[in-house]
């Protein structure tokens, strides 16, 4: 029959060429002479001339060696025609399958593969995957089936078998415990890929395994004991720098130190921070230390890392003995701010108060006193006793120097230390009011019409405090009551001035006497401008001109 079974041809054939493969034969050749031809890729189209056919015998010929990795299968058509060129058969499909030879070695996809794994992991932990390819067939043969293996490991510490590789997938995993970055930070594995499922050609590559840091080393104080000297009262003073060593990766959270004062700082006098570059612990004073109260502090400082430990590790502790150094301390007024009530206007030379300071130092130092700031110059201070006396008139109503009844004075105490030190205190004199001001009307100038005049309401003010103020009383003097009346309102804080008789247009003085609740009297002259007008007026109209 005009059919042909698929033809298998091994690649890389030795020849000789042309090589007969199979014979095309039409049973129509009994009736007529048949001529054979082939068409298709590999025959009359690219790649041309790989196959040919003997025109008269029908032998299919291979003209050169085949390469399966280039073309694994050829599909040709066979034709049979009579002498006159007429087709005697339908075109026949010819399949030529190129069978594989193991003519390619495996190739790793990279010369060097890089992976990483955390130190201290257990066997079974995946590290990385390597890949090799082989162009040969891996479906019908083992020619392209790659098996992976580890040829060598460097260094061979702590064992020569730290890693293994899955023979089929190329996944490298940990086979032994003992990965320790601090001892071996990197392993170099020579890996092999062998075709024929491990029995064929071999190629090698390198797998570099970086061992990643875990916080498996505690920071350790070096040294563990420190002595420091600190002047008393110094705040923010650097006491000591504590040094630690940590075998973990520098500048990582597993290396960066965290310091904690574990004991000895009952008064919360100290603080400790980590230096960002050196990793040292910087111990400083949070509050001033007091030599007289405690001249030595023994601190216990523990160090850990920013990152938690991955396993139970003993923590390192340092002992710091802090010696407090005595300094000449300034005298301190007791209290720092003293409030004294004193009546305003007391006589000159009258004692106001005694204001003294104490010296924190143990020695009996002599303290002398003086006034540092006395804005009005009202006071004097005895340099030995701290006695404050009045040398001027204390005036509660003096708005330049007194605020809210308080006159503020700053005093100074100086010891006789070497060098001497000074301390200041604030004396707050609360001035008690005396009835030293009479009531005053506002305004003191009025304009009023001499016909149907409007009553003039004047406000009454008194610089003193209650009870030396309202209710006020009003009285007209010096015959002012002939033309005018003055009445204090019910509340007693305003006076109403009224014109009771006609006065011609002019300016007049109204003599008004006001007294407060303590009968302090004040005479005030009110300038009254009377105008020729009716009712309400603010300024007198000009003279009327008729037309």
């Amino acid at each position: 029959d005009w059919v042909v079974a698929p033809i298998s041809v091994p690649e890389n054939g030795k020849g000789p060429f042309p090589q007969r493969l199979n014979q095309l034969k039409s049973n129509k050749d009994r009736d007529t002479k048949i001529f054979y031809s082939i068409t298709g890729p590999g025959a009359d189209s690219p790649p041309e001339g790989v196959f040919a056919v003997e025109k008269e015998t029908g032998w299919l010929l291979l003209n050169k060696p085949l390469d399966r990795e280039e073309i694994a299968k050829y599909e040709l058509f066979g034709h049979a025609v009579s002498e006159n060129g007429a087709s005697v058969e339908d075109p026949m499909n010819i399949s030529i399958i190129v069978t594989d030879q193991n003519d390619h070695k495996p190739k790793f996809t990279q010369d060097t593969f890089r992976g990483s794994v955390l130190e201290g992991v257990l066997p079974g932990t995946s590290v990385m995957q390597v890949t090799a390819t082989d162009e040969d067939d891996a479906i019908y043969t083992y020619n392209g089936v790659v098996a992976y293996s580890i040829h060598s490991q460097e260094p061979k510490d702590p064992h020569d078998l730290m890693f293994t590789i899955h023979r089929s997938t190329g996944t490298i995993s940990v086979i032994s415990s003992g990965l320790d970055r601090e001892k071996v930070p990197e392993y170099t594995l020579t890996i092999q890929a062998t075709d024929m499922d491990g029995d064929g050609s071999t190629t090698t590559a390198v797998a570099v395994v970086e061992i990643l840091d875990a916080n498996d080393n505690a920071p350790m104080f070096d040294p563990q004991k420190y002595e420091a000297h600190v002047p008393e009262n110094a705040v923010g003073h650097e006491v000591q720098r504590l040094t630690v060593t940590d075998l973990d990766a520098p500048n990582s959270p597993a290396w960066r130190a965290t310091y904690l004062i574990m004991g000895g700082d009952d008064g919360d006098h100290f603080t400790i921070t980590t230096h960002p570059e050196s990793n040292q612990g910087i111990l400083t004073t949070r509050k001033g230390l007091d030599f007289e109260a405690k001249n030595q502090h023994t601190l216990y400082v523990e160090v850990t890392n920013e990152a938690p430990f991955v396993l139970k590790l003993p923590t390192s502790t340092a002992t710091i003995v802090v010696h407090v150094e005595d300094v000449n301390e300034a005298p301190v007024f007791v209290p720092p701010s003293k409030v004294v009530e004193v009546q305003e206007g007391i006589p000159t030379g009258e004692p106001v108060c005694v204001y003294t300071a104490e010296d924190p130092d143990k020695e009996n130092q002599k303290i002398s006193y003086r006034i540092l700031r006395d804005p009005a110059g009202w006071l004097a201070m005895d340099p030995d006793s701290g006695q404050v006396t009045a040398v001027g008139t204390l005036d509660r109503e003096d708005e330049q120097f007194v605020r809210n009844n308080i006159y503020e004075v700053m005093v100074l105490a100086m010891d006789n230390g070497s060098p001497p030190t000074t301390g200041t205190g604030t004396l707050l004199l609360t001035l008690i009011d005396v009835n030293d001001h009479g009531p005053v009307p506002e305004p003191r100038q009025i304009t009023i019409c001499n016909q149907s005049p409007v009553r003039q309401v004047l406000n009454i003010t008194d610089k003193d405090l209650s009870p030396h103020t309202s209710p006020f009383q009003a009285q007209l003097t010096d015959d002012s009551d002939i033309y005018w009346t003055a009445e204090v309102n019910e509340e007693g804080d305003t006076v109403v001035l009224s014109l009771k008789k006609f006065l011609k247009q002019d300016t007049y003085d109204v003599h008004l006497s006001l007294s407060d609740h303590g009968n302090k009297e004040q005479l005030t002259v009110i300038r009254a401008t009377v105008c020729d007008c009716h009712g309400h007026v603010e300024t007198c109209p000009g003279p009327w001109k008729g037309g």
């Epitope: 130190e119 066997p123 079974g124 293994t164 899955h166 997938t169 995993s173 086979i175 415990s177 003992g178």
Partner: antibody
Framework: EVQLLESGGGLVQPGGSLRLSCAAS????????MSWVRQAPGKGLEWVSA????????YYADSVKGRFTISRDNSKNTLYLQMNSLRAEDTAVYYC??????????WGQGTMVTVSS | QSALTQPASVSGSPGQSITISCTGT?????????VSWYQQHPGKAPKLILS???KRPSGVSNRFSGSKSGNTASLSISGLQAEDEADYYC???????????FGGGTKLTVL
């Protein structure tokens, strides 16, 4: 001579706790992962838990996860297994074993744990 | 049910040879050359007799040998002796948190 010696086994009621110890000698203890393997009466060997040489990494069989805790003290060359919420099916001989590459070697002599009311 | 499959029992007469198989998958026995065999006498702890498929620790008789083909490993004992009667277990490395798989064990009887 390389030696592993387990202790701490005994009779305990269901829901109770027990702590097993394994004292190691004759090798650099901190360089090796260690495992606990158990064998129920008349049954095969069953891996229970493992811990890395440093103690920073641990594995557990699903059957004991959340109930058992493996730990080690390298300064004392001792491996521990803290067993909580014990069940009848935890009854077994418990062995400690050193993990050499791809093997368990050597093994301790075992300690019997009986969980029964 | 164990991860690796072993025959429950095998037997042989003194002087004979026997083989115990241990079948896994392409991700354990088939993937790695880390198959080990252990011998356990009644009431005793297991003892390593072969590691890495066919490596004998010192002190183990050369009558014990191992091999591997595909996903199956085998333990062979030649010249059977009475003291060989014991349970035999295989283990294989595998990647993951259960990094060592156990076989169910094989009871060897020396007739």
């Amino acid at each position: 001579e390389v030696q592993l010696l387990e202790s701490g086994g005994g009779l305990v009621q269901p829901g109770g706790s027990l702590r097993l110890s394994c004292a190691a000698s004759g090798f650099t203890f901190s360089s090796y992962a260690m495992s606990w393997v158990r064998q129920a009466p008349g049954k095969g060997l069953e891996w229970v838990s493992a811990i890395s040489g440093s103690g920073g990494s641990t594995y557990y069989a699903d059957s004991v996860k959340g109930r058992f805790t493996i730990s080690r003290d390298n300064s004392k060359n001792t491996l521990y297994l803290q067993m909580n919420s014990l069940r009848a099916e935890d009854t077994a001989v418990y062995y400690c074993a050193t993990n050499s590459p791809g093997t368990f070697d050597p093994w301790g002599q075992g300690t019997m744990v009986t969980v029964s009311s | 049910q164990s991860a690796l499959t072993q025959p429950a029992s095998v037997s042989g007469s003194p002087g004979q040879s026997i083989t115990i198989s241990c079948t896994g998958t392409s991700n354990d026995v088939g993937a790695y050359n880390y198959v080990s065999w252990y011998q356990q006498h009644p009431g005793k702890a297991p003892k390593l007799i072969l590691s890495e498929v066919n490596k004998r620790p010192s002190g183990v008789s050369n009558r014990f040998s191992g091999s591997k083909s595909g996903n199956t490993a085998s333990l062979s004992i030649s010249g059977l002796q009475a003291e060989d009667e014991a349970d035999y277990y295989c283990t294989s490395y595998t990647m993951g948190s259960t990094f060592m798989l156990f076989g169910g064990g094989t009871k060897l009887t020396v007739l």
